[in-house]
Interface confidence: medium
């Protein structure tokens, strides 16, 4: 029951945590299960124990085997087992199943791939990421802390993702790689969160008194048929139709445009002959659908003629 599988590649660092947990103050002793020989704690050894952690720096195929850890407290002892397998590095690109960590699934709205076991290591950014052995390039991929974020996930993004990082131990660097599969699931064809593309939250829009001004409220709602999706403008919390200012009107822009498969809506607010009092109003762009509502607020400011000239 208190046994844990751990694996790694030869010549890489491998750190294993004792499957039995205890307070940091408790001592943990590590042994080779077959020989009952104690594992040293001195860091000059290639394999050494450091509290709850057993460190292979670097690992060798011959290190494979079962290791016993005993968590000792004043009142009890707890025993755990770490089943460690070290594999030879593959010459080809394929990552065999036995080296794979748990599969994660993502969607258009949630595409984080966490680097497995990284929290055991003393590493510094950046993390390197590979898909099917190819280094990931392009603005859609963002290595963020201990995970990879993929923007606008598509079904083609499914595959095996490998993270590579450097573990530092007393000034010496060791390489670590870990691979897991990523699958893409369709979130039932719609998004729960309207995303307002424009305007930005609390945007200040510069306008010229006496001229016409247009404000566009643009939001996307997900893929496929959208229930109750709408975008609209409010002035000081009141719908345009109820506000009673004929100079200010809204009209639908593109209806349900499917760029990138996303269902989006636009609503343009047209202000004719901008007046001083228009600068005092609060303009709210609202995006709502079946599941909720998001609001972005815009205010108008007078365009400085000097700025205009420059």
């Amino acid at each position: 029951k208190f046994s844990k599988q751990s694996w790694g590649l030869e010549n890489e660092a491998l750190i294993v945590r004792c499957p039995r947990q205890g307070k940091p103050s408790y001592t943990v002793d590590w042994y080779y299960s077959q020989t009952n020989k104690s594992i040293p704690t001195q860091e000059r050894n290639r394999v050494f124990a450091s509290g709850q952690l057993l460190k292979f720096l670097p690992a060798a195929v011959a290190d494979s085997g079962i290791y016993t850890c005993i968590v000792r407290s004043p009142t009890f002892n707890r025993t755990g087992y770490a089943n460690v397998t070290i594999y030879k590095k593959q010459s080809d690109c394929n990552v065999p199943d036995y080296l794979m960590y748990s599969t994660v699934s993502g969607s258009e709205k949630n595409s984080k791939i966490y680097c497995p076991t990284i929290d055991l290591y003393n590493w510094t950014a950046p993390l390197e990421w590979f898909k099917n052995c190819q280094a990931l390039q392009g603005s859609r991929y963002r290595a963020h802390k201990s995970f990879l974020v993929i923007d606008n996930v598509m079904t083609e993004d499914a595959g095996d993702y490998t993270c590579k990082f450097i573990h530092n131990e007393n000034g010496a660097n060791y390489s670590v790689t870990a691979t897991r599969s990523f699958t893409v699931k369709d979130e039932q064809g719609f998004s729960l969160f309207p995303v307002i593309g424009a305007p930005a939250q609390n945007e200040i829009k510069e306008v010229e008194i006496g001229k016409n001004a247009n404000l566009t409220c643009s939001a996307c709602f997900g893929k496929g048929t959208q229930f109750l999706a709408a975008v609209l403008w409010q002035l000081n919390g009141t719908k345009i139709t109820d506000f009673g200012e004929p100079r200010i009107q809204q009209e639908e822009g593109q209806n349900q445009s499917f760029s990138n498969g996303l269902a989006c809506l636009d609503m343009v607010l047209r202000i004719a002959d901008v007046k001083e009092e228009d600068l005092l109003l609060q303009y709210d762009c609202l995006a709502l659908n079946l599941h909720g509502l998001r609001r972005h607020t815009v205010r108008l400011s007078r365009k400085n003629p000097i700025d205009h000239h420059s």
Epitope: S107, K109, N110, E187, Q188, F190, L192, F193, Q201, F227, L228, A229, A230, V231, L232, K239, L286, L288, L290, H291, G292, L293, R294, R295
Partner: antibody
Framework: QVQLVQSGAEVKKPGSSVKVSCKAS????????MHWVRQAPGQGLEWVGV????????TYAQTFQGRVTITADESTSTAYMELSSLRSEDTAVYYC?????????????????????WGQGTTVTVSS | DIVMTQSPDSLAVSLGERATINCKSS????????????LAWYQQKPGQPPKLLIY???TRESGVPDRFSGSGSGTDFTLTISSLQAEDVAVYYC?????????FGQGTKVEIK
């Protein structure tokens, strides 16, 4: 306080239409969804449709598609549900119910959830 | 459509005892992006409209006594009345609002033994 007051009971002939009203008070009408749910005698609850008064958009259960129209009059904070081509199996109590709203500061988003305020119900009897 | 199935159809419990109602959805109503279960529970007493008790599967609506609690995730949910009171005699419905159409369970009638 927040309340929904529905129009009185109706007796209708098969093939005719009925329009039930639901007057909201005590909250900003356009900020909340309004659902319509019906309950046949001795039966469970059946969702009819919903309107977002703020955007005016509606969606209906497939069962009622083409026969039901939900509208909202913001000036009077009243929602309406009109059901046409009535048949005897439409005999039921019709409820309007406000969709609950919960603000999430982390998402800067207003979630709609469940139905937190209900009207008293309007009995519609369809009989020849 | 997501089908909601409640069990049992009726339940007789002694005053002060625990009452448990189960609700199963034909597909998950957990939206992983916000980790919320789009499930609500309602109480309906004879001649009255339903009353919202629980939303997001486990959040008690304000004013609802704390003897009512909701639990579960994904497809399996439970409404528990920890100590049944006389005023709790009613029909209880679960409802998903994850997708259109919104659907209800068939109801569970709770009576006093």
């Amino acid at each position: 306080q927040v309340q929904l007051v529905q129009s009185g009971a109706e007796v209708k002939k098969p093939g005719s239409s009925v329009k039930v009203s639901c007057k909201a008070s005590g909250y900003t009408f356009t900020d909340y969804q309004m659902h319509w749910v019906r309950q046949a005698p001795g039966q469970g609850l059946e969702w009819v449709g919903v309107i977002n008064p703020g955007g005016g958009s509606t969606t209906y259960a497939q069962t009622f598609q083409g026969r039901v129209t939900i509208t909202a009059d913001e000036s009077t904070s009243t929602a309406y549900m009109e059901l046409s081509s009535l048949r005897s199996e439409d005999t039921a109590v019709y409820y309007c119910a406000r969709g609950g709203v919960e603000y999430s500061s982390s998402w800067d988003y207003y979630y709609y959830y469940g139905m937190d305020v209900w009207g008293q119900g309007t009995t519609v009897t369809v009989s020849s | 459509d997501i089908v909601m199935t409640q069990s049992p159809d009726s339940l007789a419990v002694s005053l002060g005892e625990r009452a448990t109602i189960n609700c199963k959805s034909s597909q998950s109503v957990l939206y992983r992006s916000n980790n919320k279960n789009y499930l609500a529970w309602y109480q309906q007493k004879p001649g009255q409209p339903p009353k919202l008790l629980i939303y997001w599967a486990s959040t008690r609506e304000s004013g609802v006594p704390d003897r009512f609690s909701g639990s579960g995730s994904g497809t399996d949910f439970t409404l528990t009345i920890s100590s049944l009171q006389a005023e709790d005699v009613a029909v209880y419905y679960c409802q998903q609002y994850y997708s259109i159409p919104v659907t209800f369970g068939q109801g569970t009638k709770v009576e006093i033994k």
